[in-house]
């Protein structure tokens, strides 16, 4: 079948999800496409515990997550509600800064060197994290 009951090689399992941590950089859209090619998505952070887990693995390096406001409001790539969900922005962020001189504002969110979030130009080649959930069917206890 197509059920994913365990994490692929080189992925890290944590709380019924699998995570893969890149060691190179891509623009946000290319990182998003890469994760989708792996039947996954850019990481969606839903709790302080998950934040600490990801932060531990990426270290002090700018790293894309699956959060953007390219179409207006901030949205998580898997549909998780942004307004009611976990947030960990740096002070004064997001600021949609236009002063970088690259054209436009800042529409994609990343982990900064201290783990807190910042919005930045989506074309910057940052590292990224993919996440995929283990199948719900596989989480049910076996019938006796």
């Amino acid at each position: 079948g197509s059920e994913r009951t365990c994490c692929p090689v080189n992925w890290v399992e944590h709380e019924r999800s699998c995570y893969w941590f890149s060691r190179s950089g891509k623009a946000w859209a290319d990182a998003d496409n890469y994760c989708r090619l792996e039947d996954a998505h850019l990481v969606v952070v839903t709790s302080w515990e998950e934040q600490k887990f990801v932060q531990h693995h990426i270290g002090p390096v700018n790293t894309w997550m699956g959060l953007h406001d390219q179409n207006g409001p901030w949205k998580w790539v898997d549909g998780t509600d942004y307004e009611t969900g976990f947030k960990n922005w740096r002070p004064e962020q997001p600021d949609d800064w236009y002063g970088h001189g690259l054209g436009g504002g800042e529409d994609c969110a990343h982990f900064t060197d201290d783990g807190r979030w910042n919005d930045d130009v989506c074309q910057r080649p940052y590292r990224w994290v993919c996440e995929t959930e283990l199948d719900k069917a596989s989480q049910e206890p076996p019938l006796l």
Epitope: S2, R4, P8, V9, N10, W11, W20, S22, R23, S24, G25, K26, A27, D30, N33, Y34, R36, L37, E38, D39, P125
Partner: antibody, heavy 123, light 107 residues
Framework: EVQVLESGGGLVQPGGSLRLSCAAS????????MSWVRQAPGKGLEWVSA????????YYADAVKGRFTISRDNSKNTLYLQMNSLRAEDTAVYYC????????????????WGQGTLVTVSS | DIQMTQSPSSLSASVGDRVTITCRAS??????LGWYQQKPGKAPKRLIY???SLQSGVPSRFSGSGSGTEFTLTISSLQPEDFATYYC?????????FGGGTKVEIK
């Protein structure tokens, strides 16, 4: 040994349809994204389409978007390319190819190719 | 789309020569680049992946270098079986794009 074998090519009239197949063996098919690449007679290589291992995501070159559909049947270890509204410029040898993962788990495209199947679009 | 400009489009060389082929990307692609060899009527064969990693089973006279926008394939000592067409491929961004090819012919 990794093997991919294309089939389904042939002569078709402009506006017609054709479905290519690629039978894979020697690796865990569902764990790998797969691609189609084509080569017009006497020309260079052109990437056509890609699909994720479980089929959840697909990607297309602009030249074929809306006309070609990539799919896979992991129970049969087979990749497909459904080609509709064919044009003379689609005439090419079509190759099926898989990628590989490096030691960090990063995917690199196109390490094993089939021998190709020729599609000729002509009236 | 990322354009891959490959040069030269053709070259003539002798057995034992050192041959260098270049690919230039229209924007940075990190090291998401492979090099392929194709002989007439045959499927392409990957020689190099990740810009500089040698594919298993490929002779060590083939090497790749570069990162970002400039990449090079070098054949340190050309052998008779190396006369073929060579292509680069970038996979940093969709659509994937190939260079136009370099035909290596016998002088």
């Amino acid at each position: 040994e990794v093997q991919v074998l294309e089939s389904g090519g042939g002569l078709v009239q402009p506006g017609g349809s054709l479905r290519l197949s690629c039978a894979a063996s020697g690796f865990t098919f569902s764990s790998y994204a797969m691609s189609w690449v084509r080569q017009a007679p006497g020309k260079g290589l052109e990437w056509v389409s890609a699909i994720s291992g479980r089929g959840g995501s697909t990607y297309y070159a602009d030249a074929v978007k809306g006309r070609f559909t990539i799919s896979r049947d992991n129970s049969k270890n087979t990749l497909y390319l459904q080609m509709n509204s064919l044009r003379a410029e689609d005439t090419a040898v079509y190759y099926c190819a898989k990628g590989s993962y490096d030691s960090s788990g990063y995917y690199h495209y196109l390490d094993h190719w089939g021998q190709g199947t020729l599609v000729t679009v002509s009236s | 789309d990322i354009q891959m400009t490959q040069s030269p489009s053709s070259l003539s060389a002798s057995v034992g020569d050192r041959v260098t082929i270049t690919c230039r990307a229209s924007q940075g692609i990190e090291n998401d680049l492979g090099w392929y060899q194709q002989k007439p009527g045959k499927a392409p064969k990957r020689l190099i992946y990740a810009a500089s990693s040698l594919q298993s089973g490929v002779p060590s006279r083939f090497s790749g270098s570069g990162s970002g926008t400039e990449f090079t394939l070098t054949i340190s000592s050309l052998q008779p079986e190396d006369f073929a067409t060579y292509y680069c491929l970038q996979h940093n961004s969709y659509p994937l794009t190939f260079g136009g090819g370099t035909k290596v012919e016998i002088k």
